[in-house]
Interface confidence: low
């Protein structure tokens, strides 16, 4: 058992038929002795007597909020959640596993820059009863400090019949240094309370593994003289670390046809401009990626031909 | 400025190299072995390799104000990754082909380092671990995790020397 | 000569964690691998992964992944060996070995891990 | 993972005969990373051979490896008293080594 914030504790237990669980002494906060008597939740019924209560918790009947009274006031709460560990692995019930990167990917997290900040975000499929809190530092032996917000629902989606509530919240590293090559991986980990049920999730990473641009910015067509030819432009996205002569992207220029079975063209330039043929009913679009890091590429930024 | 009494690299050279290095040491990270290793977690295990870190210079306004120190960390980190490329971890069993990105990875280490350090200039180098031939399963790690962190130093080299190249070039 | 010495034996509930030391002296411990084979009463060996100790960089066997965790300290030429959620038939020798190009040729003196309610 | 096959599981012989131990691989052992040991009762194992067929320091002359690609030998010359024992046959040259089941060679 731990003390997850004041009056919050958490038990874990190994959940497999008739597992013995877990002897529990709560201990009543009061300067008082004598006539103390504990009850569960919003039952009357007492569960036994004196400053200490001994419970054994085996299953989320024996979770809840326990309180302590004495003549009809309540001295002290203490609040009892469940860690459920599996065959030796910790339940991952309350949120959706994304499968992308790679199985068991539960916590998903981009950056649009190097300066430290970051966002991160969750699926679930849970409505009601739930909460986050997130903590996150940069290493984990000696941590450096990382800050985060409120977990807030940033997004609901249907899913055949399932409704799906994405969550996310967003970090700041307190003192980053966007130029330096990182060593140590920032931790993030995200603790989940579904009603009785304690989970948490955990992500590793850096920041140079998780870049993602945002799309180019200002994208124009310029037709050339007697051509079929034009000068498409572009700028780096606002949100990009600069100066760009350091913090350099490459970027990608598509020409599509209307139809998606249709040939793509494609052109891979370091400059801010490139020369296409612009077909007829076509588009064309640009993404930008880190110069020097094959990190993620950013969305597309699309003009139409005509 | 690099500091009075120390030469300026040929920062264009140094820029076309490093851009080539970060190309090549994307090209070799699938042929280290037949397995993605990134489920060992990228945990806190780089004790011996050397980093560009935040006191080192390597950011635009360091690079402005000296560009030595940055420069002379970097040619420490290129010394240190051409001889672990050329070590027992890369030439022994599993061996990789002779025209592979490796190769030509270490080869253009090499080269980078020269165009920073010319003949008769010296910098000191950081020691080299000296490894015991390995086994094939220490190799393929070693392998997959030392050019997964090469690959974060050449980014940042690279970035050194196309600012370089654009705004401290005579 | 290097010589492997391994922490005592233990005696440990289900559903716990054992951590296993083994300190290497007489050789240079940084230089070479270390595995981690065990041997279940009247069993054969089994690898369960190992760990270069001057990078820290640790490999380990599928079977073990998420379960065991090797790691080392060069300060004190020790390597550890933590596996969690014991069940019974965890129940075992557990050796260190080093692990260089010729297979293990130094080997720990084993520690019984007994794994019981 | 590569699976070693010992056989026999117990070969019963008396001193002084000859002892042949087979150890066959699911696939090519990469390199021919093949390694033999003997251990005794209460005791770690000991290191034989290496690399298929090099003996290890220390390692009597009367023990000798040899094979390549899948299969793999350890022959005993001539049995000593101290050389009963169990066999294992063990193959580093893959990402997750892995050990045959043994083999017991006891007096007959």
């Known amino acids: 058992i731990w003390e997850l914030k004041k009056d919050v504790y958490v038990v874990e237990l190994d959940w497999y038929p008739d597992a013995p669980g877990e002897m529990v002494v709560l201990t009543c906060d009061t300067p008082e002795e004598d006539g103390i008597t504990w009850t569960l939740d919003q039952s009357s019924e007492v569960l036994g007597s004196g400053k200490t209560l001994t419970i054994q918790v085996k299953e989320f009947g024996d979770a809840g909020q326990y309180t302590c009274h004495k003549g009809g006031e309540v001295l002290s709460h203490s609040l009892l959640l469940l860690h459920k560990k599996e065959d030796g692995i910790w339940s991952t019930d309350i949120l959706k596993d994304q499968k992308e990167p790679k199985n068991k990917t539960f916590l998903r997290c981009e950056a649009k820059n190097y300066s430290g900040r970051f966002t991160c975000w969750w699926l679930t499929t849970i409505s009601t009863d739930l909460t986050f809190s997130v903590k996150s530092s940069r290493g984990s032996s000696d941590p450096q400090g990382v800050t985060c917000g409120a977990a807030t629902l940033s997004a609901e989606r249907v899913r055949g019949d399932n409704k799906e509530y994405e969550y996310s919240v967003e970090c700041q590293e307190d003192s980053a240094c966007p130029a330096a090559e990182e060593s140590l991986p920032i931790e993030v980990m995200v603790d989940a309370v579904h009603k009785l049920k304690y989970e948490n999730y955990t992500s590793s990473f850096f920041i140079r593994d998780i870049i993602k641009p945002d799309p180019p910015k200002n994208l124009q067509l310029k037709p050339l003289k007697n051509s079929r030819q034009v000068e498409v432009s572009w700028e780096y996205p606002d949100t990009w670390s600069t100066p760009h002569s350091y913090f350099s992207l490459t970027f990608c220029v598509q020409v599509q046809g209307k139809s998606k079975r249709e040939k793509k063209d494609r052109v891979f330039t370091d400059k801010t401009s490139a020369t296409v043929i612009c077909r007829k009913n076509a588009s064309i679009s640009v993404r930008a990626q880190d110069r020097y890091y094959s990190s993620s590429w950013s969305e597309w930024a699309s003009v139409p031909c005509s | 400025r690099a500091v009075p009494g120390g030469s300026s690299p040929a920062w264009t050279q140094c820029q076309q190299l490093s851009q080539k290095l970060c190309t090549l040491a994307w090209s070799a990270h699938p042929l280290v072995g037949h397995m993605d290793l990134r489920e060992e977690g990228d945990e806190e295990t780089t004790n011996d390799v050397p980093h560009i870190q935040c006191g080192d210079g390597c950011d635009p306004q360091g690079l402005r104000d000296n560009s030595q120190f940055c420069l002379q960390r970097i040619h420490q980190g290129l010394i240190f990754y051409e001889k672990l490329l050329g070590s027992d971890i890369f030439t022994g069993e599993p061996s990789l082909l002779p025209d592979s990105p490796v190769a030509q990875l270490h080869a253009s280490l090499l080269g980078l380092s020269q165009l920073l350090q010319p003949e008769g200039h010296h910098w000191e180098t950081q020691q080299i671990p000296s490894l015991s031939p390995s086994q094939p399963w220490q190799r393929l790690l070693l392998r997959f995790k030392i050019l997964r962190s090469l690959q974060a130093f050449v980014a940042v080299a690279a970035r050194v020397f196309a600012h370089g190249a654009a705004t401290l070039s005579p | 000569q290097v010589e492997l010495v391994q922490s005592g034996a233990e005696v440990k509930k289900p559903g716990s964690s054992v951590k296993v030391s083994c300190k290497a002296s007489?050789?240079?411990?940084?230089?070479?691998?270390i595995s981690w084979v065990r041997q279940a009463p009247g069993q054969g060996l089994e690898w369960m992964g190992g760990i270069i100790p001057m990078f820290g960089y640790a490999n380990y066997a599928q079977k073990f992944q998420g379960r065991v965790t090797i790691t080392a300290d060069e300060s004190t030429s020790t390597a550890y060996m933590e596996l969690s959620s014991l069940r019974s038939e965890d129940t075992a020798v557990y050796y260190c070995?080093?692990?260089?190009?010729?297979?293990?040729?130094?080997w720990g003196q084993g520690t019984l891990v007994t794994v019981s309610s | 993972d590569i699976v070693l096959t010992q056989s026999p599981a117990t070969l019963s012989l008396s001193p002084g005969e000859r002892a042949t131990l087979s150890c066959r691989a699911s696939q090519s052992v990469l390199g021919n990373y093949l390694a033999w040991y003997q251990q005794k009762p209460g005791q770690a194992p000991r290191l034989l051979i290496y690399?298929?067929?090099s003996r290890a320091t220390g390692v009597p002359a009367r023990f000798s490896g040899s094979g390549s690609g899948t299969d793999f030998t350890l022959t005993i010359s001539s049995l000593e008293p101290e050389d009963f024992a169990v066999y294992y046959c063990h193959q580093y040259g893959s990402i997750s080594t892995t050990f045959g089941q043994g083999t017991k060679v006891e007096i007959k």
């Open positions: 007489g050789g240079t411990f940084s230089n070479y691998a």
């Open positions: 690399g298929a067929s």
């Open positions: 070995a080093r692990d260089i190009y010729a297979g293990m040729d130094v």
